[in-house]
């Protein structure tokens, strides 16, 4: 018949009695039985005792007594009683079991870690138990991760089981630290804590810190040290392979360093004595952590004397560009042991002669390269112990970028003007190595007419390259070149000679070596305007004239040109604009704003200023003119006409000059006959003066002139007689 | 390496308001609590605030700047904050910047910035 | 007035052992682990012991920490002249909800 399971006296999954009390349980089976006790239960504890006896009916069945005296909190746990010597197959029906809560208020958990805390070993993505189990199952436990965070139970990843603890069903990096049961019972707080700690397989790195590869001369001592760097809770193996392995020739040493408060340094250090042929070959360090494993390599080579050998590595003769940062001068070197380098300049030497020169390894290193670096090198190369000695030398060409002097020299912040017509002089003086070859270009200025932009001149255009024969912008006398020394430096000069100037443009002299090239800007700009800014006055007015003033300049160094009248007000200077250039009149030179002010009163005189703003500088410039207005005058003579003789056919002038305000009109009469310009007859400048050609007795008669203006008039008459008259006159 | 530097450290009147910022680098900021300790001219050193590592559940601060002073935290920024109102003279000090380690205290300091409270 | 309550000064000779006392409440260190740092002048503090007793990578083991209830101790044997620093014990305070300082000692390397 199938077998009962043993029975307890306390129903149940579990039950809770109280710390200092006497724990009574019976089991009751049909087998013998024994009982399985908590860890901190001692079977051989005096408070313990377990009686048996036969009980049931016809005293069949089988009985057995536990009796925990005093019972304690850490007496918590399973109790079971289970049958003996019966298949571990059917164990559900043999054993019956029971988690006892020995309640204690001064003690919440079981185990309490509250000096030095538990450490708890875990896995990543495993289970993990905090085994803050209590003493009673309704105590409210709190899980900290130190100090800041509370993990809470999500009856999923985090669950509260009171007989467990905690049970973090995935644990992650983010559960390793110090984590803190807290459970408060009557108002005081109790904590037990845990190190959960990760042991881990990772090898951060590995490596052997002996040069590679190794070179040891026969006899002499190798000592190759391989460091292993790893996490803190990582531990490792370092094993070493090596050529003559079979004889142990080596010795190995290993040592930790922990005082790294990141990482965990092994080290493992292979020497073996008075090396040999045999010796040379693969050193392998090979660094095992459970399934995670690195090695590193290094080649011994094992020399029976001291030697040297050195090669250009390129070729004898070496080119490098002043003004690089750093050139490196170097020699193919074979050598063992490594022998005592020198290098000489020009057979000096080099680190002693400038601060620039470095030695590193079998290189010379010249910083901040100037023209004055090339040369001759030698290395020097000794071993001295062994006598051994070689040398050779290498020759450094240091090219310079052309540099345009003038351009360096020339400290004008806005272009010069040429002169409409005239014959110009440009010249360039360009140095650099290679010798540099200079060719001029041109670029003529773009002429835009339209409102909205000024005349400018820009890179924009097109270039053309000019020889002597060119015949695009302005005629070219000549393109020479010469040799100069200047500051001791042979340099080229190239002049251009410009015939005849007419068109504004841009010429460039472009110097080019195989290191660059470098160009020269010279802004020509054509003035037909004295200094590119003139201001002129048509003549000063008088009340009821019109003021005329005209203001020139030239249209690729000026922009913004606009009249002004200055007028002090409070002892200050005020400016007031009377035109703009929408106004103005675009010529091929030059731009030009008129001003005409109608019939002026006394009130227009004043300072009248043109301003004009320099393209180049941005600075503006005022030229100003002084304006006063005349009153009106009656005109007067400043002499009048006086009778005079005159030979026939000879020429006469008649005088009649007259001021007034406006300048009187001057009219002039014969016998009352207004006089015209007629052949033989010619009226001067203003009518002021009567010249009469090859006089005829015709001419003879009363002239008479009249000056007139808006104030009134005055004249002047006078008897011109012809000597000398013809027969009929000589007859009469 | 592991660092931590502040800064927002001046001169501000009683009264005033200053935001002080500390930028970690060499760990991942998110995973640990942070915390601001103050050590006032010639004195020792006193707890301010401290923060979670998520930064939304636990914040805690002396009681002298409770209502005053805030912790707060952006992870995308590895930067810590602390935003300090109604500033006091006696709030005068140097304001370091600290990291939780997973086991120790205050396993990282950076290396402070000044406030000063005066007018 | 600090929560934890250090000794403001502290000395001794070269070679000799010192010992800095810290002494709190049930709150405080009875309940909780408590950390020792070391400031030199001008300086941030550095995490000297932690977890009462333990020691940092990169700390000599000259320095000691221990507890006992409610008070702490920090010992360093083998003074140097580079010792010569505040020292501040620390631990979380239940009750205040934060950590909480010692007012710190100062312990000076005598000759």
């Known amino acids: 018949s199938k077998l009962k399971g043993p029975e307890l006296s306390l129903k149940g999954t579990q039950h809770v009695t109280q710390a200092g009390q006497t724990l009574h349980l019976q089991c009751r089976g049909e087998a013998a039985h024994q009982w399985s006790l908590p860890e901190t239960v001692s079977k051989e504890s005096k408070r313990l005792s377990i009686t048996k006896s036969a009980c049931g009916r016809n005293g069949k069945q089988f009985c057995s007594t536990l009796t925990l005296n005093a019972a304690q909190a850490n007496h918590t746990g399973f109790y079971s009683c289970k049958y003996l010597a019966v298949p571990t197959s059917k164990k559900k029906e043999t054993e019956s079991a029971i988690y006892i809560f020995i309640s204690d208020t001064g003690r919440p958990f079981v185990e309490m870690y509250s000096e030095i805390p538990e450490i708890i070993h875990m896995t990543e993505g495993r289970e993990l138990i905090i085994p803050c189990r209590v003493t009673s199952p309704n105590i409210t436990v709190t899980l900290k991760k130190f100090p800041l965070d509370t993990l809470i139970p999500d009856g999923k990843r985090v669950i509260w089981d009171s007989r467990k603890g905690f049970i973090i069903s995935n644990a992650t990096y983010k559960e390793i630290g110090l984590l803190t049961c807290e459970a408060t019972v009557n108002g005081h707080l109790y904590k037990t804590n845990y190190l959960t700690h990760r042991q881990t397989n990772t090898i951060i790195d590995v490596q052997i810190s002996t040069p590679r590869p190794v070179k040891l001369l026969r006899g002499h001592t190798l000592i190759l040290n391989c460091t292993a760097t790893t996490p803190l809770n990582t531990r490792v193996q370092m094993t070493w392979s090596y050529p003559d392995e079979k004889n142990k020739r080596a010795s190995v040493r290993r040592r930790i360093d922990q005082s790294n408060s990141h990482a965990n340094i092994f080290y493992s250090v292979l020497t073996i004595d008075k090396v040999q042929n045999k010796d040379k070959g693969l050193y392998t360090c090979r660094v095992r952590s459970g399934p995670s494993f690195k090695s590193v390599n290094t080649s011994v080579h094992i020399y029976d004397k001291a030697f040297i050998t050195v090669k250009h590595r390129k070729q004898q003769v070496l080119e490098t560009v002043a003004g690089k940062r750093s050139y490196r001068l170097s020699m193919k070197v074979k050598a063992f042991p490594s022998p005592e380098v020198v290098w000489l300049k020009d057979g000096l030497p080099a680190t002693e002669k400038s601060a620039r020169y470095l030695t590193r390894g079998y290189s010379l290193i010249i910083k901040d390269v100037t023209e004055e670096d090339a040369g001759n090198y030698t290395i020097l190369l000794s071993i001295k112990q062994s006598n051994v000695f070689k040398n050779l030398t290498a020759t450094l060409i240091v090219n310079v970028k052309p540099q345009i002097y003038e351009k360096a020299v020339s400290s004008f912040p806005d272009p010069a003007l040429y002169p409409l017509g005239s014959r110009q002089i440009l010249t360039c003086t360009a140095y650099g190595i290679p010798r540099p070859t200079i060719k001029w270009c041109w670029r003529p200025c773009n002429h835009n007419h339209s409102e909205a932009r000024y005349d400018f001149c820009s890179n924009n255009e097109e270039s053309f390259i000019l020889d002597p024969d060119s015949n695009i912008g302005n005629r070219i006398e000549s393109i020479t070149q010469r040799m100069a020394i200047i500051e001791g430096k042979n340099k080229t000069a190239s002049t251009l000679v410009v015939a005849d100037s007419r068109i504004s443009g841009i010429y460039s002299c472009i110097a080019s070596n195989k290191v660059g090239t470098v160009g020269r800007n010279i802004s020509f700009y054509i003035t037909d305007v004295p200094n590119g800014f003139h201001v002129n006055l048509e003549k000063m007015p008088t009340e009821g004239e019109d003021l005329k003033l005209s203001c020139t300049v030239n249209k690729f160094l000026y922009r913004d040109v606009t009249w002004i009248l200055l007028r002090t007000v409070n002892n200050r200077t005020m400016h007031y604009s009377i035109s703009k250039q929408k106004m103005a009149i675009t010529k091929e030179h030059s731009i030009t704003l008129n001003l005409t002010i109608m019939n002026v009163s006394l009130e227009d005189s004043g300072t009248y200023a043109c301003r004009a703003r320099n393209v180049y500088t941005g600075e503006e410039i005022l030229q100003k003119k002084e304006v006063t207005i005349r009153d009106q005058e009656a005109p007067y003579l400043l002499r009048n006409l006086s009778d005079h003789t005159v030979a026939i056919s000879s020429s006469t002038t008649l005088d009649c000059h007259a001021n007034g305000a406006p300048e009187p009109q001057i009219t002039w009469f014969k016998n009352n006959h207004k006089i015209q310009q007629e052949p033989g007859i010619i009226l001067g400048p203003g009518s002021s003066t009567l010249f009469i050609e090859r006089v005829t007795e015709e001419d003879e008669g009363v002239y008479h002139c009249k000056a007139t203006n808006q104030k009134g008039s005055v004249e002047s008459s006078a008897y011109l007689t012809v000597q000398g008259t013809s027969d009929k006159s000589n007859l009469e | 390496e592991v660092q931590l530097l502040e800064s927002g450290g001046g001169s501000v009147q009683p009264g005033g308001s200053l935001r002080l910022s500390c930028t970690a680098s060499?760990?991942?900021?998110?995973?640990?609590?942070m915390n601001w300790v103050r050590q006032a001219p010639g004195k020792g050193l006193d707890w301010v605030s401290s923060i979670n590592r998520q930064g939304d559940i636990s914040t805690y601060h002396v009681d002298s700047v409770k209502g005053r002073f805030t912790i707060s935290r952006d992870n995308s920024k590895n930067t810590l904050y602390l935003q300090m109102n109604s500033l006091r003279a006696e709030d005068t000090a140097i304001y370091y910047c600290?990291?939780?380690?997973?086991?120790?205290?205050?396993?990282?300091w950076g290396q402070g910035t000044t406030v000063t409270v005066s007018s | 007035q600090s929560v934890l309550t250090q000794p403001p000064s502290a000395s001794g000779t070269p070679g000799q052992r010192v010992t800095i006392s810290c002494s709190g409440s049930?709150?405080?260190?009875?309940?909780?682990?408590v950390n020792w740092y070391q400031q030199i002048p001008g300086t941030a503090p550095k995490l000297l012991i932690y977890?009462?007793?333990q020691r940092p990578s990169g700390v000599p083991d000259r320095f000691s920490g221990s507890k006992s209830g409610t008070s702490a101790s920090l010992a360093i044997s083998g003074l140097q002249s580079d010792d010569e620093a505040d020292y501040y014990c620390a631990s979380w305070d239940d009750s205040l909800n934060g950590w909480v300082f010692g007012g710190g000692t100062k312990l000076t390397v005598l000759g």
């Open positions: 600290t990291k939780n380690h997973d086991y120790h205290g205050m396993d990282v």
């Open positions: 977890l009462n007793s």
């Open positions: 060499g760990f991942n900021f998110e995973d640990y609590g």
């Open positions: 049930r709150s405080n260190i009875g309940n909780n682990f």
